[in-house]
Amino acid sequence: DPVKPSRGPLVTCTCESPHCKGPTCRGAWCTVVLVREEGRHPQEHRGCGNLHRELCRGRPTEFVNHYCCDSHLCNHNVSLVLEATQPPSEQPGTDGQ
């Protein structure tokens, strides 16, 4: 059941998001989530994961990229990018000339 909280050993992760009460948190895994909301610049949030491990396997889109790892402070220096959007008139691999 993907919604069930993990009961394995906990790992310490860097916590950098509006929900953090301090610089680290403890969870089943560490996360970095890069999110771009409509009309805003992307925000990169670091924290802990305990639920929905399936999100870790999601492919990056132009709006979200979800990264997970399983070791001590492994999310600290991770930097993510969003999937680039391809204008409909251009094909990948062309230089527009």
């Epitope: 860097t14 950098e16 998001s17 953090c20 009460k21 610089p23 990169e44 670091r46 930097s79």
Partner: nanobody, 125 residues
């Protein structure tokens, strides 16, 4: 509500030093606290920032070696030590705070959710 209060600005002679402080209240933790400055008629420029989780400071190239950012964890206060000041350092210095950190945007004003009112620094020749 969150408040950032800067202090320590003033008038100093070229070659002198100042130490600015920024005290945060209304929230216990920020991921990043930074300093920006704005000279009359110019854009607001990045000075430096400190990442709270590891205490690593990042600086604008032109400030490296002269300016140092540090923090007091217990008081949610960040400091900007400015040495070898020059007349072109004259500006209003702003403290800024963000609930997150990004390697690609820590030097941009848009990453910061909260701003202080600013403190005037004037360097005379």
């Amino acid at each position: 509500q969150v408040q950032l209060v800067e202090s320590g600005g003033g008038l100093v002679q070229a070659g002198g030093s100042l130490r600015l402080s920024c005290a945060a209240s209304g929230r216990t933790f920020f991921a990043t606290m930074g300093w920006f400055r704005q000279a009359p008629g110019k854009e607001r420029d990045f000075v430096g920032a400190i990442r709270w989780s590891d205490g690593v400071a990042y600086y604008a190239d032109s400030m490296k070696g002269r300016f140092t950012i540090s923090r007091d964890n217990a008081k949610s206060t960040v400091f900007l030590q400015m040495n070898s000041l020059r007349p072109d350092d004259t500006a209003v210095y702003y403290c800024a705070a963000s609930t997150y950190f990004s390697f690609t945007t820590y030097y941009t004003a848009r990453m910061y959710d909260y701003w202080g009112q600013g403190t005037q620094v004037t360097v005379s020749s």
